[in-house]
């Protein structure tokens, strides 16, 4: 079965800056990735970026740079300043829409014991399944 992993890292150089990395472990082709914070997309979460593998990338503050890292993983850098900046216990979620598997979402946050600049290895987070 497909899985989604989420990794959250606080940058050592800027303590209010976060990097979120997400990946899809499955055989299908990815049609869309949505990154949100504050909970799953459509369940109280706020969209930070939407990435289409060919059409392009859309992102909104405090997202600074969303990009594809590979054909099945993405990264997102968050700028931390002002009221909309993330905090250490913020939950980030990534939803991968894939054909033919459907839609798969996982969430993660900064590991409680992490030092800045360190992060837990990118292990699959709890999986939520939703039909396309």
């Amino acid at each position: 079965t497909p899985e989604v992993w989420v990794q959250v890292r606080m940058e050592a150089t800027e303590l209010s800056s976060f990097t979120i990395r997400c990946g899809f472990l499955g055989s299908g082709s990815i049609s869309l990735v949505t990154v949100s914070w504050g909970g799953p997309n459509g369940a109280g979460g706020t969209t930070l970026a939407v990435l289409h593998p060919e059409r392009g990338i859309r992102q909104w503050a405090p997202a600074r740079q969303a990009r594809w890292e590979t054909q099945s993983s993405i990264s997102l850098i968050l700028e931390g300043s002002g009221a909309s900046s993330p905090c250490a216990n913020t939950t980030f979620c990534c939803k991968f829409a894939s054909f033919p598997e459907g839609s798969w979402e996982a969430c993660g946050s900064l590991p409680p014991s992490s030092d800045p600049g360190l992060s837990a290895p990118p292990t699959p987070a709890p999986i939520l399944r939703a039909d396309l």
Partner: antibody, heavy 114, light 113 residues
Amino acid sequence: EVQLVQSGAEVKKPGSSVKVSCKASGYTFSSFSIEWVRQAPGQGLEWIGEILPGSNSTNYNEKFKGKATFTADTSTNTAYMELSSLRSEDTAVYYCSSYWFAYWGQGTLVTVSS
Amino acid sequence: DIVMTQSPDSLAVSLGERATINCKSSQSLLNSGNQKNYLAWYQQKPGQPPKLLIYGASTRESGVPDRFSGSGSGTDFTLTISSLQAEDVAVYYCQNAHSYPPTFGQGTKLEIK
């Protein structure tokens, strides 16, 4: 079927404001940004900015900051663009678009004339 | 901002012949992570909104005839109409879909010779 239907043509005086609407149907309105594009008479296409209706997050082209303001109403699946302090050079057709410019409204002609 | 420059500004081609429009970007539109080029092509006829023809530099939008094709990578891209039809008379625009703000080329007017 995805459709974007815009409000009708407007004639405005210099210094006034205008609000253009864009009603979407056929897709999940809150999940994809509504883009706004300007085309002056006989000219090319210019991106004004975008709004993500689900969160009202916006991105503006620097050139249009202070000129354009975007809002969206998810209860009616309608996005709005207000243009303020109108000048004759704001005379143009204004388009809304969605899903990475795959779908377009029919355009709204805004004419600014004294 | 990324500057998109099209050539030629206008083009006259005989019916059934090949039409080629070029587009050059001031920065690379290639996303190295997934090796995709974020470049789109549009067709606009008088009094109508633009119509998306090609995205990802070479992927045809649904419903677009296969006589339209896109190619190129990095900073240099081409839209080709393999056999010009009367209904293809229009202005064609390329667009940077790689980074904000999305920017368009100045347009190429295609006419029948």
